[in-house]
């Protein structure tokens, strides 16, 4: 799948969205007629592909979201698609990778002025641990750049998710950003489309790890759409 | 108000040891890395390295690897660097800055460092 | 390691006048870079942070601009209060690196 090659070690943890979605790409994504987007992942490559269908963009991994494939944009068949990167057009927030929103139809970044007045909203979406709320993001990985030091370990001051070992991820703790663990299957991922959102993280998760995606957890489809829990699953 | 208090001047012998203290006051210790950066006699700066007080997660520039190590202090919220094998080329200002959100927004006043025999 | 040039080194400008000074990284950066003023004496003080976003307090005649590899700091109208060191930093990969420096003078 897309996702274990993005994961795999030849491009060593390498986070969507630095290598685009961990999921499904979306080299034509229309959200609207007569729209057309083009691939926003330089990374993607298909790989016995199976779409993934949904009909919204809470059933997406987190780094994707909902909608029609094609250029005409017909509602009645839609699937996951890679989540657009900064700078790239978008429809709506849902369609920006985390760490971005969509502001006058281009993603843009959630820049730091988004923090302070919405702290408690986010602190109470906390499951309560230190990984406790909202899917990690990182930078751009410049696969050419040297290597500096050795990977930082686990709590390891970090920038991007490439100055951490292989199976963590650059993420916030607070106001400053650590080398987490990588979400193993089952663990909790929290998934959020509010705008400006994924700037609010305050405890940071990382992505879900090879071969897995965030997804709701079956038997949480009945619940309300603010309290249904996902979970890394496999794909 | 975030303060950033940093020990006195040090006055060392070249391939001795010394230790900068960085005291904090008006913020949660916890929630922000800590850098440390060098400023060469007016010249530019340089980026040490950066220690993260949650679990004491470092990362260093190549360049002072071995030369400097960051601990903490959480019961006092207070940063530490050594730097040792101290040469004149280490004779220099320091300076503790905390981290918020990848820039460097609150500084200490700096110490400075004078290596001689 | 992303290499931050900066220039120019010195600039001797009169009162009133509009200071331009520039940054150019030898990688892509997006728009992580920040901008300090240094006076005698005294430690950096942060301007402008990632996103071209002007600190609180800070007057807005400082300004900023740029994404990818070329950045520009922009003082609209100097004041004699404004002679002082800049600095600009990138903060998009570690290790983080600083420009050279400008030396802002009153001419």
């Known amino acids: 799948t897309l996702n274990s090659v993005l994961n795999s070690n030849a491009i060593k943890n390498l986070p969507p969205p630095l290598g685009g979605a961990a999921g499904h790409p979306g080299s034509a994504v229309s959200a609207a007629p007569g729209i057309l987007y083009p691939g926003g992942n330089k990374y993607q490559t298909i790989d016995n592909y199976q779409p993934y269908p949904c009909a919204e963009d809470e059933e997406c991994g987190t780094d994707e979201y909902c909608a029609s494939p094609t250029r005409g944009g017909d509602a009645g068949v839609q699937i996951c698609l890679a989540c657009r990167k900064r700078r790239k057009r978008c429809m709506r927030h849902a369609m920006c990778c985390p760490g971005n929103y969509c502001k006058n139809g281009i993603c843009v970044s959630s820049d730091q002025n988004h923090f302070r007045g919405e702290i408690e909203e986010t602190i109470t979406e906390s499951f309560g641990n230190d990984h406790s709320t909202l899917d990690g993001y990182s930078r751009r990985t410049t696969l050419s750049s040297k290597m500096y030091h050795t990977k930082g370990q686990e709590g390891s001051v970090c920038l991007r998710s490439s100055d951490c070992a292989s199976g963590l991820c650059c993420a916030r703790h607070f106001w400053s950003k650590i080398c987490k663990p990588v979400l193993k299957e089952g663990q909790v991922c929290t998934k959020h489309r509010r705008k400006g959102s994924h700037g609010l993280e305050i405890f940071q998760r990382c992505y879900c790890g090879e071969g897995l995606s965030c997804r709701i957890q079956k038997d949480h489809h009945q619940a309300s759409n603010s309290s249904r829990l996902h979970t890394c699953q496999r794909h | 108000e975030v303060q950033l208090q940093q020990s006195g001047p040090e006055l060392v012998k070249p391939g001795a040891s010394v230790k900068i203290f960085c005291k904090t006051s008006g913020y949660t210790f916890t929630e922000n890395t800590m850098h440390w950066v060098k400023q060469t006699h007016g010249k530019s700066l340089e980026w040490i390295g950066g220690?993260?007080?949650?679990?004491?997660?470092?990362s260093y520039n190549q360049k002072f690897k071995g030369k400097a190590t960051l601990t903490v202090d959480k019961s006092s919220s207070t940063a530490c660097m050594e730097l040792r094998s101290l040469t004149s080329e280490d004779s220099t200002v320091y300076y503790c800055?905390?981290?918020?959100?990848?820039?460097?927004?609150?500084w200490g006043q700096g110490t400075s460092v004078t290596v001689s025999p | 390691e992303t290499t931050v040039t900066q220039s120019p080194a010195s600039l001797s400008m009169a009162i009133g006048e509009k200071v331009t000074i520039r940054c150019i990284t030898s990688?892509?950066?997006?728009?992580?870079m920040n901008w300090y003023q240094q006076k005698p004496g005294e430690p950096p003080k942060l301007l402008i942070s990632?996103?071209?976003t002007l600190r609180p307090g800070v007057p807005s005649r400082f300004s900023s601009s740029g994404y990818g590899t070329d950045f520009v700091f922009t003082i609209e109208n100097m004041l004699s209060e404004d002679v002082a060191d800049y600095y600009c930093?990138?903060?998009?990969?570690?290790?983080?690196?600083f420009g050279g420096g400008t030396k802002l003078e009153i001419k």
């Open positions: 990632e996103g071209n």
């Open positions: 930093l990138q903060s998009d990969n570690l290790p983080y690196t």
């Open positions: 800055a905390r981290d918020w959100l990848g820039a460097m927004d609150y």
């Open positions: 990688t892509d950066i997006d728009d992580d």
């Open positions: 220690i993260n007080p949650h679990k004491g997660g470092t």
